[in-house]
């Protein structure tokens, strides 16, 4: 028969020949010939190949460097690599995350918009008007200024983005 | 640990038949193509026939062709040779070996078969 | 069929020379199929080399193989006394048959 130029799906092609690839969680050992079916060896401890493969070599589980921050989010398996995560009070520097960074603060004048998590940094917002920040947090959204009226209070001294209003008592009218 | 051990061989008269077997151990026997190989008494290697994986492709060498069969019983782990109508330069110590594209990477530790009046 | 011819037919030399031994094939031959085997008296063959220059595995990397086309090489590069036996090349890319060189001897001088 005609040798085949294409090969089913889960095969490869090699000196004319379609061979079974390996499933994921074991790399190649030896080409399938006319006689014998593709040879394949389970990936070893802290290795993993996560596709169907005619690889040679099992890449090595990532590494979650201490040093760096990191910490194993998930532990790897023979067919998935293992996920790292940043330890409490910081964030992944990138996709990968292969190192990390302090949660940024938002300043006076701003607010969390959205908490920090391993993989990403604070958002931060600048306080509306009617709203303020007196302290650089991680978690402390703006505060309403407070309503001066709803304790039978005037407003003594405007509020800003960064400060409270100030309440006073009403000045009595005098007879 | 993987291993081919072959049994069956002996002296036997021109003409009359014999049959070799070889079992298998510690691979996956069912994966694996399986070849016979001889070798006369001081002779060089030669090889007499090879069995699929799943037996369906079967070649011979020329000087055996018609006379011998080789098969296999995956359930059994074991490979076989029919040896008929033999000569006596069927002569020689046969070697069961596996198939890879790596050449033949496990052999057992043969069986002599003599073929003498 | 695919004639291999191994050259010479016998290699004396002591241990700690370098042996040299030649597969010379009547037609081209696939580097990818062309193996290596060592044969000591009274046992069974051992792959030593596949795919003309890839070491089997546990064979020490003082054995090497090289060549293409029709013109194999076999080297041990310092022979230890267990190296002494015999050494047949084997082509499995064009088949039936598989064939094998006639081998070469390798004795102590």
């Known amino acids: 028969p005609e040798p085949p130029t294409a090969c089913r799906e889960k095969q490869y092609l090699i000196n004319s020949q379609c061979c079974s690839l390996c499933q994921p969680g074991q790399k190649l050992v030896s080409d399938c010939t006319e006689f014998t079916e593709t040879e394949c060896l389970p990936c070893g401890e802290s290795e993993f190949l996560d596709t169907w493969n005619r690889e040679t070599h099992c890449h090595q589980h990532k590494y979650c460097d201490p040093n760096l921050g990191l910490r194993v989010q998930q532990k790897g398996t023979s067919e998935t690599d293992t996920i790292c995560t940043c330890e409490e009070g910081w964030h992944c520097t990138s996709e990968a995350c292969e190192s990390c960074v302090l949660h940024r603060s938002c300043s006076p004048g701003f607010g969390v918009k959205q908490i920090a998590t391993g993989v990403s940094d604070t958002i931060c917002e600048p306080c509306p008007v009617g709203f303020f920040s007196n302290v650089s947090s991680a978690f402390e959204k703006c505060h309403p200024w407070t309503s001066c009226e709803t304790k039978d209070l005037v407003v003594q001294q405007a509020g800003t983005n960064k400060t409270d209003v100030v309440c006073g008592p009403q000045d009595r009218l005098r007879a | 640990q993987v291993q081919l051990v072959e049994s069956g061989g002996g002296v036997v008269q021109p003409g009359r038949s014999l049959r070799l077997s070889c079992a298998a151990s510690?691979?996956?026997?069912?994966?694996?193509?399986m070849h016979w190989v001889r070798q006369a008494p001081g002779k060089g290697l030669e090889w007499v026939a090879v069995?699929?994986?799943?037996?369906?492709?079967?070649y011979y060498a020329d000087s055996v062709k018609g006379r011998f069969t080789i098969s296999r019983d995956n359930s059994k782990n074991t490979l076989y040779l029919q040896m008929n109508s033999l000569r006596a330069e069927d002569t020689a110590v046969y070697y069961c070996?596996?198939?890879?594209?790596?050449?033949?990477?496990?052999w057992g530790q043969g069986t002599m078969v003599t073929v003498s009046s | 069929e695919i004639v291999l011819t191994q050259s010479p037919g016998t290699l004396s030399l002591s241990p700690g020379e370098r042996a040299t031994l030649s597969c010379r094939a009547s037609?081209?031959?696939?580097?990818?199929?062309l193996a290596w085997y060592q044969q000591k008296p009274g046992q069974a063959p051992r792959l030593l080399i596949y795919?003309?220059?890839s070491r089997a595995t546990g064979i020490p990397d003082r054995f090497s193989g090289s060549g293409s086309g029709t013109d194999f090489t076999l080297t041990i590069s310092r022979l230890e006394p267990e190296d002494f036996a015999v050494y047949y090349c084997?082509?499995?890319?064009?088949?039936?048959?598989?064939?094998f060189g006639g081998g070469t001897k390798v004795e102590i001088k």
């Open positions: 510690g691979f996956t026997f069912s994966s694996y193509g």
């Open positions: 795919g003309a220059s």
């Open positions: 070996a596996r198939d890879t594209s790596r050449g033949h990477d496990i």
């Open positions: 084997q082509q499995y890319a064009d088949y039936p048959p598989f064939t």
């Open positions: 037609q081209s031959v696939s580097s990818s199929y």
């Open positions: 069995i699929s994986y799943h037996a369906s492709s079967k």
